[in-house]
């Protein structure tokens, strides 16, 4: 089971009008550049076999991957939104740094790995897609971690 006290984010993180608006604007800009509408990275399948109490830990993994493998490499794109949103998401990641689960997390890693593989397979268009789904990442983090 997760060490649940550490796998939490305060609701206030998701109620800041300015940065919330910028996050969704960034997602919108990127989704306009996404021509692969048949693939969904963040959706029901990501959570298959994952209990409600483990979902924040799963989303922490997705957030960290998105930051390290998508947003940092694409940091020169989609300005001015990117320069404001990346530090915001990095702060959320930092607040979840002590979020771990005790025992086997293989089922979670398997689901996250499928997302990673899809992004890598699609190359740059996979990275654009991941940025276009930041609204879904935001909502999934909000629902799983507050």
């Amino acid at each position: 089971a997760p060490i649940s006290s550490h796998c939490r984010l305060d609701k206030s993180n998701f109620q800041q009008p300015y940065i919330t608006n910028r996050t969704f604007m960034l997602a919108k800009e990127a989704s306009l550049a996404d021509n692969n509408t048949d693939v969904r990275l963040i959706g029901e399948k990501l959570f298959h076999g994952v209990s409600m109490s483990e979902r924040c830990y799963l989303m922490k993994q997705v957030l960290n991957f998105t930051l390290e493998e998508v947003l940092f490499p694409q940091s020169d794109r989609f300005q001015p939104y990117m320069q404001e949103v990346v530090p915001f998401l990095a702060r959320l990641s930092n607040r979840l740094s002590t979020c771990h689960i005790e025992g086997d997390d293989l089922h979670i890693q398997r689901n996250v790995q499928k997302l990673k593989d899809t992004v890598k397979k699609l190359g740059e268009s996979g990275e654009i897609k991941a940025i276009g789904e930041l609204d879904l990442l935001f909502m999934s983090l909000r629902n799983a971690c507050i």
Partner: antibody, heavy 119, light 107 residues
Framework: EVQLVESGGGLVTPGGSLRLSCAAS????????MSWVRQAPGRGLEWVSA????????YYADSVKGRITISRDNAKNSLYLQMSSLRSEDTAVYYC????????????WGRGTLVTVSS | DIQMTQSPSTLSASIGDRVTITCRAS??????LAWYQQKPGKAPKLLIY???SLASGAPSRFSGSGFGTDFTLTISSLQPDDFATYYC?????????FGGGTKLEIK
């Protein structure tokens, strides 16, 4: 071509039960959340219930909680709405609609089936 | 539940007019707002999703805007086919809720 066809509507007396069905075709049914939305005669739209693609998660409007059960059979590409303890205010056209996930709109709707609760 | 308040409830307009319908949420729903068009005896049709994205097959004269609690649907130049009832819907959280509808009539 995406198609959603509702059936099972009809006249039922107050307190009675009815089971609505929705036959889906033209898309991978198990990939989609499915919903029931109703519309009383001359009134607006009211969301009733939704179910996840796997069937593992279900959601209900407060107005129907405890009286209605949503279910699906992915092998048969079918969605169901079991209604019991029906009231006159449940009289409406019931639409079946699909949306990819929680944060997706209802992009395709069936033509609806009329449920009339009257003595 | 999140309440959706649509205005006006009825709107009379002429062919070629620019028309705006508004929708207000009782609490913030980010951009999780859809607009539907419904004609008598027919099922609703999706026009706009994520507040401002045009649905597949929807005419480009329809546009949406807004974020948080206040949203608008605009028809840039009214066509004969546009006389119908329009509904907004929030899908930020269950229970999903619809506005009361706006009936667009010929003046």
């Amino acid at each position: 071509e995406v198609q959603l066809v509702e059936s099972g509507g009809g006249l039922v007396t107050p307190g009675g039960s009815l089971r609505l069905s929705c036959a889906a075709s033209g898309f991978t049914f198990s990939d989609y959340y499915m919903s029931w939305v109703r519309q009383a005669p001359g009134r607006g739209l009211e969301w009733v219930s939704a179910i996840s693609g796997s069937g593992g998660s279900t959601y209900y409007a407060d107005s129907v909680k405890g009286r209605i059960t949503i279910s699906r059979d992915n092998a048969k590409n079918s969605l169901y709405l079991q209604m019991s303890s029906l009231r006159s205010e449940d009289t409406a056209v019931y639409y079946c609609a699909r949306g990819l996930w929680v944060w997706d709109p209802l992009d395709y709707w069936g033509r609806g089936t009329l449920v009339t609760v009257s003595s | 539940d999140i309440q959706m308040t649509q205005s006006p409830s009825t709107l009379s307009a002429s062919i070629g007019d620019r028309v705006t319908i508004t929708c207000r949420a009782s609490e913030g729903i980010y951009h999780w707002l859809a607009w539907y068009q419904q004609k008598p005896g027919k099922a609703p049709k999706l026009l706009i999703y994520k507040a401002s994205s045009l649905a597949s097959g929807a005419p480009s004269r329809f546009s949406g805007s807004g974020f948080g609690t206040d949203f608008t649907l605009t028809i840039s130049s009214l066509q004969p086919d546009d006389f119908a009832t329009y509904y907004c819907q929030q899908y930020s959280e269950f229970a999903w809720t619809f506005g009361g509808g706006t009936k667009l009539e010929i003046k």
